[in-house]
């Protein structure tokens, strides 16, 4: 689809006569018929088939055209076609005089043609004008045309549609040839797909509008080369999507059993060492002079009861002194200047003389001890509770309570952290002083065996005779296509020999 | 256990700002994207900003683009959203959430309110 | 943005009850699809996610089915503490997009 322009320029026709040589009365008024049609050897009369105008009376015998409306009429003068430009036409131009108003053929005498003239030829598509004059024996006819393509059609020959847009079908001008050209950030045969941030990932990203980077469910940053470990994920990264690697001093399917409670907490005070031993459970070794779980205790040097025979500890700068009860002395009261006539055993013992009555000794029931019966025994004394656990007095016995991850009377044995048997598929368990490691059986992996792999059972090269191997996914067994000739699980058999 | 706390909300009038904190704790927080999801009186849930764990790539619902802007302090565990030129309709719950917006929102803050009213 | 249709608005059911809530999206989201519950006052907690994937700590009697765009959260046997109001998610396409709700009130 197309127009093809021409521009009356300027006529001349000095004397003011028609074609047949008479003069116009009272000058010629001069109108012009046009007629454009397909390409003719000889330009004969017949239909218009490309199109025909006519104008407006322009002027009076000689007279240039304006290059706009003249009288209602427009310069260049249009004839639009719907069609495939063919690259050629024929085109005839006729002058007519016009006596009256009315300038329909029908309404005019034969003999008011002033001039005719019919040129035909190759014509391109182009923006520039090709001018031309045609001289007759009384008149001239300067004039210029061109064929243009309507909005929206491109090509040589006018037959490309294009338009441009914006939105969601496409983002593109029109080159002068009819090719899409995208707007900037766009990409595509109908410029329809963005152009993501540059270096924004293949796979893990994509745009719906240029320079955007939107990641695919399971990875994140600016270009979705980082992945998002697992949604109940506590103290792990990932290396793909939905992982859960434990950082160091962390356990557990979601990285949320602490197996470094001694850096994590500090539980140890006073200055004390810390030891991890297993799942959030630790070992204070204290400092001298301090005591407790978490060695929080600090210690008196009268608090180990050194001074006998009822004597009175009081703590001192340097240690600690006795104040011994009468008929005691010594450094612990440890010496008596008592008898048994002094009934000087407490708590039911009974006294026995000594050195002929110069000394005594006393024998003490159950739950009493000291030179004098006079202290309850404290089975707790000689901390006989392993890994920290705490002595409990019990009347004439005494109890553990031991700390989390440790068993036994005394607490001297490690509860296993395999006990609940946390390696899946098969997996072995091994307790380790940071925790438990898991051996997973071939086909798994993962900290405790959760992850199924799948198993090469190729790798042996199980089939005999050049068969394809296949593993099979769903029982991880090989299998052995075999070629012409042989047969068997592994092909081993050549055909006819039965096996043995 | 994991634990998102959210503070800064509060009656501002149109045109005003706003800061929200989350702090978090429980789990490490460098390595999560976390999100601001939000929730208007009567109304259902609207996703607002995520931003990425270790780069802090943000991302944001249209209606608060230029206007809201998602922040994080790995050192501190601490979410920030700065809200500027509020508007009636940002009134809302405003929930601190771990999780981007192509995955789950698996934790939750208690959330805290924010009331745009003259 | 993907609309997420979640069906009934509200329902009135009983202890022990079975109880399915639907989430329907306007175009495929695959599996990414997760489902909350919120109590009055309370904020959202992940029940399920991948469609079918139960969230650590929630109790069995909780599934999700689905695939394409329709998905489906099943309580199997109600208990009192199941009434609140549930949230379908997804999370293929940006922005993410929640559904409007489903009201679970006791009968």
């Known amino acids: 689809s197309g127009v093809f322009q021409l521009q009356l320029q300027e006529f001349v026709n000095e004397r003011g006569v028609l074609a047949s040589g008479r003069p116009c009365e009272p000058g010629c008024r001069t109108f012009f018929r046009v007629c454009l049609k397909h390409f003719q050897a000889v330009v004969s009369p017949g239909p218009c088939t490309f199109g025909s105008v006519s104008t407006p009376v322009l002027g009076t015998n000689s007279f240039a055209v304006r290059d706009d409306s003249s009288g209602g009429g427009r310069n260049p003068l249009q004839l639009p076609f719907n069609f495939t430009w063919p690259g050629t036409f024929s085109l005839i131009i006729e002058a007519w005089h016009a006596p009256g108003d009315d300038l329909r053929p029908e309404a005019l005498p034969p003999d008011a043609l002033i001039s005719k003239i019919a040129i035909q030829g190759s014509l391109a598509v182009g923006q520039n004008w090709l001018l031309d004059e045609q001289t007759s024996t009384l008149t001239r006819l300067r004039y210029s045309y061109r064929v243009i393509c309507s909005d929206n059609y491109y090509g040589d020959n006018c037959s490309r549609l294009c338009k441009k847009r914006n939105d969601h079908f496409g983002h593109y001008v029109c080159q002068p040839d009819g090719n899409l050209s995208c707007l900037p950030g766009w990409t595509g045969e109908y410029c329809q797909q963005p152009i993501c941030l540059s270096g924004c990932h293949e796979q893990n990203g994509y745009c719906s509008k240029p320079a955007e980077c939107l990641c695919r469910p399971g990875w994140q940053g600016r270009l979705c080369n980082e992945c998002i470990p697992h949604n109940g994920c506590r103290h792990g990264t990932c290396s793909t999507p939905w992982q859960c690697t434990c950082d160091e001093g962390w356990g557990g399917l979601f990285c949320d059993q602490d197996l470094n409670y001694c850096t994590h907490h500090s539980p140890c005070k006073n200055g004390a060492t810390c030891s991890n031993s297993g799942q959030r459970s630790y070992t204070c070794t204290c400092r001298p002079g301090y005591t407790g779980v978490d060695c929080e205790l600090e210690l008196s040097e009268c608090d180990s009861n050194p001074c006998r025979n009822g004597g009175s500890c009081k703590d001192q700068e340097d240690g600690y002194h006795c104040l011994c009860p009468p008929g005691y002395y010594g450094l612990h009261c440890e010496h008596s200047t008592l008898s048994c006539a002094d009934s000087p055993c407490f708590n039911g013992g009974s006294c026995r003389e000594r050195n002929q009555g110069a000394s005594y000794a006393c024998e003490c029931p159950p739950n009493f001890t000291g030179s004098n019966c006079e202290k309850k025994v404290d089975r707790c004394t000689s901390n006989p509770c392993a890994n920290g656990g705490q002595c409990l007095n019990r009347g004439p016995s005494r109890m553990c309570r031991c700390r989390p991850g440790f068993t036994g009377t005394y607490c001297e044995r490690h509860v296993s952290d395999c006990a609940r048997n946390p390696c899946a598929h098969g997996g072995t368990c091994h307790d380790l002083e940071s925790g438990l490691m898991c051996t997973c059986p071939a086909g798994f992996s993962g900290r405790r065996c959760e992850v199924r792999t799948s198993i090469d059972a190729c790798a042996s090269s199980p089939c005999f005779n050049r068969a394809t191997c296949y593993t099979d996914l769903s029982t991880d067994t090989f299998v052995c296509n075999c070629p012409y000739g042989f047969v068997g699980s592994r092909c081993e058999f050549p055909v006819g020999l039965p096996p043995s | 256990e994991v634990q998102l706390v959210e503070s800064g909300g509060g009656l501002v009038q149109p045109g005003g700002s706003l800061r929200l904190s989350c702090a978090a704790s429980?789990?490490?927080?460098?390595?999560?994207?976390m999100s601001w999801v939000r929730q208007a009186p009567g109304k259902g849930l609207e996703w607002v900003a995520s931003i990425s764990g270790s780069d802090g790539w943000a991302s944001y619902r249209d209606s608060v683009k230029g206007r809201f802007t998602i922040s994080r302090d790995n050192a501190k565990n601490s979410l920030y959203l700065q809200m500027n030129s509020l508007r009636a309709e940002d009134t809302a719950v405003y929930y601190c959430?771990?999780?981007?917006?192509?995955?789950?929102?698996?934790?939750w803050g208690q959330g805290t309110l924010v009331t745009v009213s003259s | 943005d993907i609309q997420m249709t979640q069906s009934p608005s509200s329902l009135s059911a009983s202890v022990g009850d079975r109880v399915t809530i639907t989430c329907r999206a306007s175009?495929?989201?695959?599996?990414?699809l997760a489902w909350y519950q919120q109590k009055p006052g309370k904020s959202p907690k992940l029940l399920i996610f991948d469609t079918s994937v139960l969230a650590d700590g929630v109790p069995s009697r909780f599934s999700g089915s689905g695939s394409g765009t329709d998905s489906t959260l099943t309580i199997s046997s109600l208990q009192p503490e199941d009434f609140a109001t549930y949230y379908c998610?997804?999370?293929?396409?940006?922005?993410?997009?929640f559904g409007q709700g489903t009201k679970l009130e006791i009968k």
């Open positions: 959430a771990r999780g981007y917006y192509n995955s789950p929102f698996a934790y």
């Open positions: 175009q495929e989201i695959y599996r990414n």
């Open positions: 429980g789990f490490t927080f460098r390595y999560f994207p």
């Open positions: 998610q997804q999370y293929t396409y940006y922005p993410p997009t």
